[in-house]
């Protein structure tokens, strides 16, 4: 699919039993933009790289055992975890007086599960109990899905108080304006 840069060639991670793998760091390779040149970035926001593969929505394979109480699957199941950014960070700086804050330069997309698959697994139980059969729902693919106004609201805290967005969550007024109208106003930040 469009933004799945590493659909089949991601290294398979086999963590210890019960461990959930950490997605790999987004930016390990020093190809980041210079912080000073770009006026810094809001906290918790990864810096850009020029290499799109560094922030593609990718499907990382990992394996885990399915447990149900004391019972555990005979074999581990392979699952996907959706990881990465969907394109460039969509934030632009806005300077007002001496303060600098951030506003969006595009809709916010997140790398999330797209399709799921059901898999039947056999659980082995201790103490001579009969094996149980269970159906588990596993992530089958990922996509870059747009977050709505509602989804974004909880994320404001990541960008500090200057990013507070009172408009979020308000009901749309029954009129439209062109993009030009937003230039003179305080803009929103994701």
């Amino acid at each position: 699919q469009g933004w799945q840069a590493f659909k089949n060639d991601a290294t398979e991670i086999i963590p210890e039993l019960g461990e959930y793998p950490e997605p790999p760091p987004e930016l390990e390779n020093n190809k980041t933009m210079n912080r000073a040149e770009n006026g810094g970035r809001p906290p918790h926001h990864p810096f850009e790289t020029k290499d799109v593969s560094e922030y593609s929505c990718r499907e990382l394979h990992f394996t885990r055992y399915v447990t149900d109480g004391p019972c555990r699957s005979a074999k581990p199941v392979t699952e996907l975890v959706c990881s990465g950014q969907c394109g460039p960070a969509r934030l632009l700086p806005n300077a007002i007086g001496r303060g600098k804050w951030w506003r969006p330069s595009g809709p916010d997309f997140r790398c999330i599960p797209d399709r799921y698959r059901a898999q039947r697994v056999q659980l082995l139980c201790p103490g001579g109990e009969a094996p149980r059969a269970r159906k588990v729902r596993l992530v089958a693919s990922c996509k870059c899905k747009r977050l709505t106004r509602f989804h974004n609201q909880s994320e404001l805290k990541d960008f500090g108080t200057e990013a507070a967005r009172p408009q979020k969550g308000r009901k749309p007024r029954p009129r439209a304006r062109s993009a030009k109208a937003n230039q003179a106003e305080l803009e929103n930040a994701y």
């Epitope: 850009e48 799109v52 460039p88 969509r90 747009r146």
Partner: antibody, heavy 123, light 107 residues
Framework: EVQLVQSGAEVKKPGASVKVSCKAS????????MHWVRQAPGQGLEWMGE????????GYNQKFKGRVTMTTDTSTSTAYMELRSLRSDDTAVYYC????????????????WGQGTTVTVSS | DIQMTQITSSLSASLGDRVSISCRAS??????LNWYQQKPDGTFKLLIF???RLLSGVPSRFSGSGSGTDYSLTIYNLEQEDFATYFC?????????FGGGTKLEIK
């Protein structure tokens, strides 16, 4: 007046590269992401990717990954799209388009388009 | 990728008519649907965003509606300048995708 003016038509051989420019005027260039869309003869529109002029970060349609590079020159308010390893099916009109925003409805759209650059790939 | 289908590739109508152009998405796009007009010289103009919001300066004879996977653009009282090609575009999931276009011709 907000305008996007693109470079002239290009004729290229298969395997070559092309670099199309898009000069913006009438607005603050770094305030809007620039997107690139192409239209093959008699076909629909295909989104290629976007670039944030403020940071230089770009994101591309997976279809073009490895062949396309988008850049900007903020000193001249110009966006560039380079497509490498050209094939005959890359023959198309290439458009730059500004991503505009409506803060009332919290929505985004391509509100300003360039006039298009015809790229012909032929041996 | 989300497929956007404009079933009618061309449509003939007369001045003063009302026409509807449909657009179907391969999955729910949460009303993130925009409509563009392409003139014969290749120039593009945004008409409607978020399914039904008319861009400032666009004549009120243009109207958009729909939800889920089915959307439509209606033009009332067709004028000469409306004869062009119309494209829908979804903004719900990357990559952005467009319909194949519907060419509106004079009958």
């Amino acid at each position: 007046e907000v305008q996007l003016v693109q470079s002239g038509a290009e004729v290229k051989k298969p395997g070559a590269s092309v670099k199309v420019s898009c000069k913006a005027s009438g607005y603050t260039f770094t305030d809007y992401n620039m997107h690139w869309v192409r239209q093959a003869p008699g076909q629909g529109l295909e989104w290629m990717g976007e670039i944030n002029p403020n940071s230089g970060g770009a994101g591309y349609n997976q279809k073009f990954k490895g062949r396309v590079t988008m850049t900007t020159d903020t000193s001249t308010s110009t966006a560039y799209m380079e497509l490498r390893s050209l094939r005959s099916d890359d023959t198309a009109v290439y458009y730059c388009a500004r991503l505009g925003y409506d803060d009332i409805y919290d929505d985004w759209y391509f509100d300003v388009w360039g006039q298009g650059t015809t790229v012909t790939v032929s041996s | 990728d989300i497929q956007m289908t404009q079933i009618t590739s061309s449509l003939s109508a007369s001045l003063g008519d009302r026409v509807s152009i449909s657009c179907r998405a391969s999955q729910d796009i949460s009303n993130y649907l925009n409509w563009y007009q392409q003139k014969p010289d290749g120039t593009f103009k945004l008409l409607i965003f978020y399914t039904s919001r008319l861009l400032s300066g666009v004549p009120s004879r243009f109207s958009g509606s729909g939800s889920g996977t089915d959307y439509s653009l209606t033009i009332y009282n067709l004028e000469q300048e409306d004869f062009a090609t119309y494209f829908c575009q979804q903004g719900d999931t990357l990559p952005y995708t467009f319909g194949g276009g519907t060419k509106l011709e004079i009958k």
